[in-house]
C-alpha cells in the first residue's frame, strides 16, 4: 500500500491522543535506552510503511502484535485516514485469523515495540530544524 495520500495530521492526532499511551503501557517497566535502533524512516509515508510492517507482520521471536490495543488503534487510524487502505488489508486479515496465537510478551516483542515508538516519534516530529 502507498501511504502518500494519507491524512498525516489526523493520523498524528490519533497517535498523540491514544496510540502513544498504549505503546507506553505495553513498554511499562522497560528502559527506553535498552534497545538499539534497528529501523528508521525518512518521510511520513515511509514511516507508515515501516510502522505497518512492524505492527502487523509476524517476525522471528514475536509472532504477533496485531491483537494489542495499540495495533488495533493503528489499524483503525490507517483505515479511516488512508484512502483505500481497508481494501488492501482484507486478505491479510483473513490470513491472520487462521494464524491466531496466544498473546505472549517476549523480549523480542518489547524490542519491536520500542522500534515502533521510535518510528511513531519520527512520523510525529519530522526531522527538520526549525529555522
Amino acid at each position: 500500500y502507498d501511504f502518500t495520500n494519507c491524512d498525516f495530521e489526523k493520523i498524528k492526532a490519533a497517535y498523540l491522543s491514544t496510540i502513544s499511551k498504549d505503546l507506553i503501557t505495553y513498554m511499562s517497566g522497560t528502559k527506553s535506552t535498552e534497545f538499539n535502533n534497528t529501523v528508521s524512516c525518512s518521510n511520513r509515508p515511509h514511516c507508515l510503511t515501516e510502522i505497518q510492517s512492524l505492527t502487523f507482520n509476524p517476525t522471528a521471536g514475536c509472532a504477533s502484535l496485531a491483537k494489542e490495543m495499540f495495533a488495533m488503534k493503528t489499524k483503525a487510524a490507517l483505515a479511516i485516514w488512508c484512502p483505500g487502505y481497508s481494501e488492501t488489508q482484507i486478505n491479510a486479515t483473513q490470513a491472520m485469523k487462521k494464524r491466531r496465537k496466544r498473546k505472549v510478551t517476549t523480549n523480542k516483542c518489547l524490542e519491536q515495540v520500542s522500534q515502533l515508538q521510535g518510528l511513531w516519534r519520527r512520523f510525529n516530529r519530522p526531522l527538520l530544524k526549525q529555522q
Epitope: 538499539n36 528508521s40 524512516c41
Partner: antibody, heavy 126, light 106 residues
Framework: QVQLVESGGGVVQPGRSLRLSCAAS????????IHWVRQAPGKGLEWVAV????????YYADSVKGRFTISRDNSKNTLYLQMNSLRAEDTAVYYC???????????????????WGQGTTVTVSS | SYELTQAPSVSVSPGQTASITCSGD??????ACWYQQKPGQSPVLVIY???KRPSGIPERFSGSNSGNTATLTISGTQAMDEADYYC?????????FGGGTKLTVL
C-alpha cells in the same frame, strides 16, 4: 548486533577500477540511508557519497562526481561503491556508515552517522 | 562550497572542561553532530542533532549550536577522551566535515 563490514579494498593502478562492498546486519538495512566516507593517511574525514533508503536519491562529493557510483541491493543488505578512473589522491581507508535522514517534498536532508564499519583500505599506486 | 572550521588542536588537564568549536556560515540553522576518533579506530558518534547523546556516550559529553558556531564540551575530561574530534553538518546536498581537532589530555 548492529554491524557494517566493508570489503573489496586493495592496491590498484591509477586509471583502473575497484568495487567496494558493505555488508549490513542486525538492523533493517532497507530503512536507512547509507554513506561512504574516506580518510587519507594522516588526514581528516572526507565524505564521499550517500544513497537514500530506497536508492532513489544519490549524492556525491565534487571530488568523486562522475567517477564513483554508489548503489545498494536491499535484498542482499549490501551497499556498493564502484570506483572508476582512480587517482593517487583516492588512496584512503573507506568507511560505510549508517545515516539518519529526512526528506520533505522539496529536499533531502542527511544528518548524523551512528554506525560505522571498520573500514577497507584502498591504495592507488603505480 | 560550504566549509566547517575547527582549531587543529586543543589541550586540557584531566578533570578540566574541554571546549571544541566548529564554525560555519549560519551553522546554527543546521543540525550539527560530533564524532570521536581514536588512532586506528573507526569514528564514533558522540553528539547528534546539536546536543543529543547516543546511548552509551558518557554524560560528560554535551553539545550546543547557535549562530555560526557549534561547540562540543567535555566536562571532567579523562585521559580516555584523548582523540580527534570532527564536527559534521549537511548543506545543500552535501555532507560537510570539519577538519578535525586533536584533543590532548595533559
Amino acid at each position: 548486533q548492529v554491524q557494517l563490514v566493508e570489503s573489496g579494498g586493495g592496491v590498484v593502478q591509477p586509471g583502473r577500477s575497484l568495487r567496494l562492498s558493505c555488508a549490513a546486519s542486525g538492523f533493517i538495512f532497507s530503512s536507512y540511508g547509507i554513506h561512504w566516507v574516506r580518510q587519507a593517511p594522516g588526514k581528516g574525514l572526507e565524505w564521499v557519497a550517500v544513497i537514500s533508503y530506497d536508492g532513489s536519491y544519490k549524492y556525491y562529493a565534487d571530488s568523486v562526481k562522475g567517477r564513483f557510483t554508489i548503489s545498494r541491493d536491499n535484498s542482499k543488505n549490501t551497499l556498493y561503491l564502484q570506483m572508476n578512473s582512480l587517482r593517487a589522491e583516492d588512496t584512503a581507508v573507506y568507511y560505510c556508515a549508517r545515516g539518519d535522514s529526512w526528506n520533505d517534498r522539496l529536499n533531502y536532508y542527511f544528518y548524523d552517522m551512528d554506525v560505522w564499519g571498520q573500514g577497507t583500505t584502498v591504495t592507488v599506486s603505480s | 562550497s560550504y566549509e566547517l572550521t575547527q582549531a587543529p588542536s586543543v589541550s586540557v588537564s584531566p578533570g578540566q572542561t574541554a571546549s571544541i568549536t566548529c564554525s560555519g556560515d549560519k551553522l546554527g540553522d543546521k543540525y550539527a553532530c560530533w564524532y570521536q576518533q581514536k588512532p586506528g579506530q573507526s569514528p564514533v558518534l558522540v553528539i547528534y542533532q546539536d546536543k543529543k547523546r547516543p546511548s552509551g556516550i558518557p554524560e560528560r559529553f554535551s553539545g550546543s549550536n547557535s549562530g555560526n558556531t557549534a561547540t562540543l564540551t567535555i566536562s571532567g575530561t579523562q585521559a580516555m577522551d584523548e582523540a580527534d574530534y570532527y564536527c559534521q553538518a549537511w548543506d545543500s546536498s552535501t555532507v560537510v566535515f570539519g577538519g578535525g581537532t586533536k584533543l590532548t589530555v595533559l
